[in-house]
Amino acid sequence: AGSDNPYVPCAPSPCVNGGTCRQTGDFTFECSCLPGFEGSTCERNIDDCPNHRCQNGGVCVDGVNTYNCRCPPQWTGQFCTEDVDECLLQPNACQNGGTCTNRNGGYGCVCVNGWSGDDCSENIDDCAFASCTPGSTCIDRVASFSCMCPEGKAGLLCHLDDACISNPCHKGALCDTNPLNGHYICTCPQGYKGADCTEDVDECAMTNSNPCEHAGKCVNTDGAFHCECLKGYAGPRCEMDINECHSDPCQNDATCLDKIGGFTCLCMPGFKGVHCEIEINEGNSGLNDIFEAQKIEWHENLYFQGHHHHHHHH
């Protein structure tokens, strides 16, 4: 080397990782390392993991003058000493209504009837212990089973003869088999009763009330009834009041008032009769002018009362 470039051990500093260089001779140096580093130039990160305190299977990960613990899923905290509450972390840790119980290093599930497994996800096969009659099909359900019976068999275990085979229910009734004793049960349509739905229900004899309204007369029929209505009423149960004014029976601008079983016509001045069809002849032209004016006035009043809206005459 030329004398122009004399070797200076610490210029530039050979110490890395923040180490401080100290010249110890013409050609020698010493590095003073920061905590966590070692080597002649502080090039080595000291492994801080010996005597680490990571617990419960935690893995020590070396840092600079420190270390961290990489914890298994069931543990947390600086040294993996804090238990992870899986029940809080995973609300569905236990399935199908199972109750979650946190434990150190894990969790447990208390399963409801019919479920099993670590997370209550396995449906217990109830058919393994079922006693469906041979020839029937067992269907596993949650905490139970059901037997699907072949034609002619009934009952919980398909061990009974199906009483519905002989069509004992009449009038289109629905037939079911009692799963306990095999007897048939008929669900009767409206208007019929009895074990096999052959008896007519007398709707008119029912004690609670007359099914026909407005004093209509109840007439029983097979499987049903009908109502004979009083004048002025209609409908299956005489529930509707007939509006006799609907056909405009009143004449000469008269107002029709509907009444039960009839109507009343309110005549304009100068008219009379049930339908206001008769004109009253006064024979006085002067009076006629007065009546004409009165007729308009009356007409206005009645019209307003009957229809509740303005009607202008010009």
């Epitope: 070692e38 801080d48 005597n51 305190r53 600086q78 040294f79």
Partner: antibody
Framework: QSVEESGGRLVTPGTPLTLTCTVS????????MSWVRQAPGKGLEWIGI??????TLFYASWAKGRFTISKTSTTVDLKITSPTTEDTATYFC??????????????WGPGTLVTVSS | AQVLTQTASSVSAAVGGTVTINCQAS???????LAWYQQKPGQPPKLLMY???TLESGVSSRFKGSGSGTQFTLTISGVQCDDAATYYC?????????????FGGGTKVEIK
């Protein structure tokens, strides 16, 4: 920051004795605490350590079964389960100097004297 | 069990002189985590040096630590009367293989 031992006294052999180390100015959740003893005219002898964070206990091989270390939020106890005359010594409580590393002890109590004699 | 051996149980030095205290470990000290303590009669030990060579805050620079692995040295230069005390080395070992901590037997320094 300070530590102070208490509970040292004259006991007869076989009578259990508990020493207490009370700390102030720092948290036991951050620092390891060790118990060290020194028999009259003898050298220092490490008994055991309770580690911060994990609360893991380590004992010297000669001390296992003879001593029990435990702690509360502000105290560290050393129970001498069945003292013998060889357990006569001054007992020191010492704080670890670096968090997470046993390393060295940079804070010591004045010590408490235990005398075991019949 | 791990053992730290301080070869000299006592040394004497003149004021202004140099004292060297050796400490040998039966097995490698973890990451050179070796400390030196000074203890005077009736007092607890006082930390001087840790990490084999790092001076504790407030301690005189006349104290110097060196060594690695199993061999460590404490050197006191420009010895003063106040340095009269017993000096202990203390090391950290792998807890999994026995004792985590061990102290040396101590070296008493007397000033002539």
């Amino acid at each position: 920051q300070s530590v102070e031992e208490s509970g040292g006294r004259l006991v007869t052999p076989g009578t259990p004795l508990t020493l207490t180390c009370t700390v102030s100015g720092f948290s036991l959740s951050s620092y390891d605490m060790s118990w060290v003893r020194q028999a009259p005219g003898k050298g220092l002898e490490w008994i055991g350590i309770i580690q911060a964070g994990s609360n893991t206990l380590f004992y010297a091989s000669w001390a296992k079964g003879r001593f029990t270390i435990s702690k509360t939020s502000t105290t560290v106890d050393l129970k001498i389960t069945s003292p013998t005359t060889e357990d006569t010594a001054t007992y020191f409580c010492a704080r670890g100097g670096v968090i997470f590393i046993i390393g060295h002890f940079n804070l010591w109590g004045p010590g408490t004297l235990v005398t075991v004699s019949s | 069990a791990q053992v730290l051996t301080q070869t000299a149980s006592s040394v004497s030095a003149a004021v202004g002189g140099t004292v060297t205290i050796n400490c040998q470990a039966s097995q490698s000290v973890v990451n050179n985590r070796l400390a030196w303590y000074q203890q005077k009669p009736g007092q607890p030990p006082k930390l001087l040096m840790y990490g084999a060579s790092t001076l504790e805050s407030g301690v005189s620079s006349r104290f110097k630590g060196s060594g690695s692995g199993t061999q460590f040295t404490l050197t006191i230069s420009g010895v003063q009367c106040d340095d009269a005390a017993t000096y202990y080395c203390q090391g950290e070992f792998l807890c999994s293989s026995g004792d985590c901590v061990a102290f040396g037997g101590g070296t008493k320094v007397e000033i002539k």
